[in-house]
Amino acid sequence: SERCDDWGLDTMRQIQVFEDEPARIKCPLFEHFLKFNYSTAHSAGLTLIWYWTRQDRDLEEPINFRLPENRISKEKDVLWFRPTLLNDTGNYTCMLRNTTYCSKVAFPLEVVQKDSCFNSPMKLPVHKLYIEYGIQRITCPNVDGYFPSSVKPTITWYMGCYKIQNFNNVIPEGMNLSFLIALISNNGNYTCVVTYPENGRTFHLTRTLTVKVVGSPKNAVPPVIHSPNDHVVYEKEPGEELLIPCTVYFSFLMDSRNEVWWTIDGKKPDDITIDVTINESISHSRTEDETRTQILSIKKVTSEDLKRSYVCHARSAKGEVAKAAKVKQKVPAPRYTVELACGFGAT
């Protein structure tokens, strides 16, 4: 056959769907690879062809669209399963072609099982709620396009094995789950089960997401440098190891990049000749506030090094701060015999 632009296996789109549930999968060509949409392609006389390779097989085979009750069907650029079966797992390819043009992409589809409490190997999206921030909502994700707006589905929300009915501060409101005032105790996995009728059959869509309660922007502050500070003086003799920790607290801020860096005499450590190493560690609080520690280390410090300016810098979306470390050379202890002799008036 003639050449086809093959985009290969798009592993970025590792699609996971639950067994025995409907699934609608759009051909990724139009979303990520081509500059035109399905309607344009269709009106230009291009045809979309689907085929698949079963799990642990190498053989590409056409998809059987003649199964009972149209279990697998295609509608425009969407491949439909009503519902999926465990052995639908495999690599699926959509190919757009006519006599002069061809483009195709493959993607993996994994059909996964869940237990009665909705545990499964499914990768869960994380939704962050601000602590004690007033009413916040999460919405049952990825259910658009499964049923027309005229159909009114029933939606049931669960936390683990338990249907949410009368939680203290969590209220199911159809497709939304409202948190009146989010607390750490609201951390966990929440599942919505959407039930809808179609052609005399009842289908269920199960969607689980992880709720993580994080620090509120109301409480956010610019970075706070705990160390170095004015109370600690790094007093060293030449030849000793100099260790200065820079410890910075960052309030949680959605999508903020937290940065910590040292300057020595106003330059980045990489830009100067002294043998300096910097080790970083990061820890998080329960609400994802962050503490970063960068330890500046000079194995054998020289008297020159002890005269330099060591400044710790920190930056977040809330602002930038800096603090100099107090570094000085230790004054050698007076030699006892000499002092004693001087004291007795010896010359």
Epitope: S116, C117, N166, F167, N189
Partner: antibody, heavy 122, light 107 residues
């Protein structure tokens, strides 16, 4: 390991109420459910209801709706089951049970209390 | 609610022999079934969940099988401490329901 310790045996008159306690001890995940199950002499196990102490949610078996109240005191890690309008057929051993978390499918009755015998007799 | 029916009501077995207990659900419960053991004067103890997974500390002589509506608990070689009452429980649908129990007694 988590342990559940229940209050002692009770003898009650028909028409009165009984309140059985269940205290959890040992290291524990903060979010779990406490189940209540009863067993009449020589009979099988009958689920009565549950509470999720941290979220205050309760649910009761239809048979006991209106007669049973399950509560919890988080500060003392204690759950309570109160059954009112007692009759002779409520004579049974009442058990509390729990899992480690809300998410353990099939293990929500993993840890059991020792049981409390409630005798209803005039 | 789902009705769980256990059979037989009583099973007489000699020590060292195999015991097979049955549990039937009035509708499919998938693999969402647990088995409990209860000795006189004691609380029940979880043996099996997910129809076939042994709970922590349960000896390998206990095994569970089945899915849908038909389930089996097998004790491969009965020990003296295994003579007790065994209950199945479904947790597929609320309310979670127990069977009426099978008493395993010494023959």
């Amino acid at each position: 390991q988590v342990q559940l310790v229940q209050s002692g045996a009770e003898v009650k008159k028909p028409g009165s109420s009984v309140k059985v306690s269940c205290k959890a001890s040992g290291p524990s995940n903060p979010v779990y459910a406490i189940q209540w199950v009863r067993q009449a002499p020589g009979q099988g196990l009958e689920w009565m209801g549950y509470i999720i102490p941290l979220h205050g949610q309760v649910d009761y078996a239809q048979k006991f709706q209106g007669r049973v109240t399950i509560t919890a005191d988080e500060s003392t890690s204690t759950a309570y089951m109160e059954l009112s309008s007692l009759r002779s057929e409520d004579t049974a051993v009442y058990y509390c049970a729990r899992g480690q978390t809300l998410y353990d499918s099939g293990r929500q009755f993993d840890i059991w209390g020792q049981g409390t015998l409630v005798t209803v007799s005039s | 609610e789902i009705v769980m029916t256990q059979s037989p009501a009583t099973l007489s077995v000699s020590p060292g022999e195999r015991a097979t207990l049955s549990c039937r659900a009035s509708q499919s419960v998938s693999s969402n079934l647990a088995w409990y053991q209860q000795k006189p004067g004691q609380a029940p103890r979880l043996l099996i969940y997910g129809a076939s997974t042994r709970a922590t500390g349960i000896p390998a002589r206990f095994s569970g099988s089945g899915s849908g509506t038909e389930f089996t608990l097998t004790i491969s070689s009965l020990q003296s401490e295994d003579f007790a009452v065994y209950y199945c429980q479904q947790y597929n649908n609320w309310p979670w329901t127990f069977g009426q129990g099978t008493k395993v007694e010494i023959k």
